[in-house]
């Protein structure tokens, strides 16, 4: 029986050109984590494997840094980075746990505009 739960950073927004940390936390299970995958929709971004360490997909090497911890840092954000991100924890004996994060990348002017006209 799978007892674990994944807590994620949820829905987040960031400014174009900036960076953001994606984080997931698996708790409430004694299952052994063997690998953590980070995916963007259907694309693999990175893997952290118990025996092999980190692997960053070649197409993201310049813009993705591992960590902190089992998280992932996305840099030099573009509007095209907007979308769903998934952390996939492979565990034994439980199986797979998946967490979802939605990232919205805002145009700098939009972010500034929103901040300037916030209702107190």
């Amino acid at each position: 029986m799978m007892t674990g739960t994944i807590e994620t950073t949820g829905n987040i927004s960031a400014e174009k050109g900036g960076s953001i940390i994606l984080q997931c936390h698996l708790s409430s299970t004694t299952a052994q984590v063997t690998q953590v995958n980070w995916e963007q929709q259907d694309q693999l971004l990175a893997i952290c494997n118990a025996d092999l360490g980190w692997h960053i997909s070649p197409s993201f090497k310049d813009r993705v840094a591992p960590g902190p911890g089992l998280g992932l840092t996305l840099q030099s954000l573009t509007v095209n980075d907007t979308g769903e991100y998934f952390c996939i924890y492979h565990t034994y004996p439980d199986g797979t746990y998946t967490g979802r994060i939605f990232l919205e990348v805002l145009e700098s002017s939009v972010a500034e505009h929103g901040a300037r006209f916030q209702i107190p």
Epitope: H25, S27, Q35
Partner: antibody, heavy 117, light 107 residues
Framework: QVQLQQPGSELVRPGASVKLSCKAS????????MHWVKQRHGQGLEWIGN????????NYDEKFKSKVTLTVDTSSSTAYMHLSSLTSEDSAVYFC??????????WGQGTTLTVSS | DIVLTQSPATLSVTPGDSVSLSCRAS??????LHWFQQKSHESPRLLIS???QSISGIPSRFSGSGSGTDFTLSINSLETEDFGMYFC?????????FGGGTKLEIK
């Protein structure tokens, strides 16, 4: 098997600089963060900073930013920590440690740095 | 920076006893908390990762629990080799930080 090899000791003069080394073997050097940790007189542990050899990305504790520079030589699988303008406060044991899926899973034996005239 | 507070600073116990060591985080670090043992003139050794993940080669008498701000390392039926310093460490955000340590000594 995974090993992190550090020199046992270094003796340097106040005001000088030193470059401590940590030679990794038994794993793919570029796939793991390497961290450096300071311990004075058998007291607590202080995180200095880290470097990801796959990209050269570094992070430092603010306290050590002006004191420390972390580098790697991927061809020899060696991590380096350069400490500048040494004082007696820098006398300590310095450990390198690898961060994997299970956090700091392997540690070097530590280098005892003595700053004395 | 995240602050980790360990208590007690020193714990005097008898072999065979069971003990619980505490590590309190401020602010919340979810489950990004790790436990290390260090004996005199040795390197630290990883005991538990991510609050409760067991580590290969570590005796089963060591276990970890907690999430958020309160964490516990439990050692069942202490053996003489278990005496030494114990540190917690967080990897939720940079800069990583360590707790001040708990010294486990023989009564």
């Amino acid at each position: 098997q995974v090993q992190l090899q550090q020199p046992g000791s270094e003796l340097v003069r106040p005001g000088a600089s030193v470059k401590l080394s940590c030679k990794a073997s038994g794993y793919t050097f570029t796939s793991y963060w390497m961290h450096w940790v300071k311990q004075r007189h058998g007291q607590g542990l202080e995180w200095i900073g880290n470097i990801y050899p796959g990209s050269g990305t570094t992070n430092y504790d603010e306290k050590f930013k002006s004191k420390v520079t972390l580098t790697v030589d991927t061809s020899s699988s060696t991590a380096y920590m350069h400490l500048s303008s040494l004082t007696s406060e820098d006398s300590a044991v310095y450990f390198c440690t690898r961060e994997g899926l299970y956090a700091f899973d392997y540690w070097g034996q530590g280098t005892t740095l003595t700053v004395s005239s | 920076d995240i602050v980790l507070t360990q208590s007690p600073a020193t714990l005097s116990v008898t072999p065979g006893d069971s003990v619980s060591l505490s590590c309190r985080a401020s602010p919340n670090i979810r489950n990004s908390l790790h436990w290390f043992q260090q004996k005199s003139h040795e390197s630290p050794r990883l005991l538990i990762s991510y609050a409760s993940q067991s580590i290969s080669g570590i005796p089963s008498r060591f276990s970890g629990s907690g999430s958020g701000t309160d964490f516990t390392l439990s050692i069942n039926s202490l053996e003489t080799e278990d005496f030494g310093m114990y540190f917690c460490q967080q990897s939720n955000s940079w800069p990583y930080t360590f707790g001040g340590g708990t010294k486990l000594e023989i009564k």
